[in-house]
Interface confidence: medium
């Protein structure tokens, strides 16, 4: 049996949310049982259609209405022929979209004016992904390549931080991290040393 993936190059790049139909052509068999395989696992769902073009020529379709990152992978079709499994050339499906956060800034509790770090990482595709940091509604750093660490010299009140990830498909905003002030017991060295630093916010370093 002749088996080939049609209508798709070896690499297929699709934007997140767009539909995809993969076509598989089988020739030389009267009633092929066409199976779709993704990353080695048979696709077990009903989003499939099989069309008889002629008695010995069939086309199978795998239909995805709205692709998302989890649909990305290596697809091929296969048929059983005389006890042998025949496999088509694979197609690599890449799903592009706005950046996806793998690390987002976390809430922290820190003593007044104590230095701390926040981390942010986002991935494509497409790459590259760049990171911009925000303190409340003020942009405080970037853009810089992902992953990014924000070094803050200290805060004197509860402050909100977030990061924004940019690529060619657009931008995504992270969760907002709240940095709370840790209550320091009276008489502690931290209180004595730092109570006079009313405006100790220094422009943070912005580095990879």
């Amino acid at each position: 049996a002749g088996l080939k993936l049609m209508g798709a190059p070896v690499k297929l790049t699709v934007s997140q949310g767009q539909p995809v139909k993969l076509n598989c052509s089988v020739e030389g068999m009267e009633e092929p049982d066409i199976q779709w395989v993704k990353d080695g696992a048979v696709v077990q769902n009903l989003d499939q259609l099989y069309i008889p073009v002629s008695e010995q020529h069939w086309i199978g379709f795998l239909s995805l209405k709205s692709v998302e990152r989890s649909d990305a992978g290596r697809y091929w079709c296969q048929v059983e022929d005389g006890g042998e499994t025949e496999i088509s050339q694979p197609v690599w499906l890449t799903v592009e979209g706005v950046p996806f956060f793998t690390v987002e800034p976390k809430d922290l509790a820190v003593p007044p004016n104590a230095p701390f770090q926040l981390s942010c990482e986002a991935v494509g595709p497409p790459e590259p992904v760049t990171i911009v940091w925000w303190r409340g509604t003020t942009k405080i750093g970037g853009p810089a390549p992902s992953p990014s660490v924000l070094n803050v010299t200290g805060v004197t009140q509860s402050t909100m931080f977030s990061c924004e990830a940019h690529n060619l498909k657009g931008l995504a905003s992270s969760r907002t991290a709240t940095v709370h002030l840790q209550l320091v017991p009276r008489g502690s060295s931290a209180h004595h040393h730092h109570h006079h630093h009313h405006s100790a916010w220094s422009h943070p370093q912005f580095e990879k």
Epitope: E31, D33, Q44, N45, L46, Q48, I51, S63, K65
Partner: antibody, heavy 125, light 108 residues
């Protein structure tokens, strides 16, 4: 012309077994899936399940899994819906549906092109 | 198990636009299909894959889908459009089909 001829059914008692059939003509039986759809009196449509073109794969709706069996005989181009033990709540019209097709765009088993006339199954003690 | 939710009834005057909605969590990923069933008859497919009209169905029938909601629109409803309308789609994992509860369209 595509035709789906469904069998009739007499009144059955709860606990009885029953098999209803759907004989296809006017097309190559193994080119299409067959699905079954239930409609209780005065109620809506319920997707029961489907059987693949060559009979190798069956899918069932959660409400019907384990309660009915879908099968097909390729030699007679006939699909079957079988109950081992009927309940009064099985009283309904049952449609067989030829799924998929030669027109572009449809996906199985959603693109229902041809419906049988239905088999009314009355279950009463 | 997965459900598709439709309004039980919609009423319009002849010539008005009728809109029938269908909501389901999987609709962003799965296509919606619309069936018309007139009294005592088997259902007839009118729209497939969200917005494609079946050959032979009047142009006044159209479909759309956005997020978790699919909509069947009948622009300039006629008395003969009075029927029950059902949406159909697949569950999230694609392993079984589901019909909505149906909407009775009355064209007064």
């Amino acid at each position: 012309e595509v035709q789906l001829v469904q069998s009739g059914a007499d009144v059955k008692k709860p606990g009885a077994s029953l098999t209803i059939s759907c004989q296809a003509s006017g097309y190559t039986f193994t080119d299409y899936w067959i699905s079954w759809v239930r409609q209780k009196p005065g109620k809506g449509l319920e997707w029961m399940g489907a059987i693949s073109r060559n009979g190798s794969t069956t899918y069932y709706g959660p409400s019907f899994q384990g309660h009915v069996t879908i099968s097909a005989d390729r030699s007679t181009a006939t699909a079957y819906l079988q109950w081992r033990s009927l309940e009064a709540s099985d009283t309904a019209m049952y449609y067989c549906v030829r799924s998929g097709g030669l027109t572009s765009g449809g996906t199985i088993p959603e693109y229902y092109q041809h419906w049988g006339p239905g088999t009314l199954v009355p279950v009463s003690s | 198990s997965y459900e598709l939710t439709q309004p039980p009834s919609v009423s319009v005057s002849p010539g008005q636009t009728a809109r029938i909605t269908c909501s389901g969590d999987a609709l962003p990923k799965k296509y919606a299909y619309w069936y018309q069933q007139k009294s005592g008859q088997a259902p007839v497919l009118v729209i497939y894959e969200d917005k494609k009209r079946v050959s032979g169905i009047p142009e006044r029938f159209s479909g759309s889908s956005s997020g978790t909601m699919a909509t069947l629109t009948i622009s300039g409803a006629q008395v003969e459009d009075e029927a029950d309308y059902y949406c159909y789609s697949l569950a999230v994992d694609g392993n079984y089909g589901v019909f909505g509860g149906g909407t009775k369209l009355t064209v007064l």
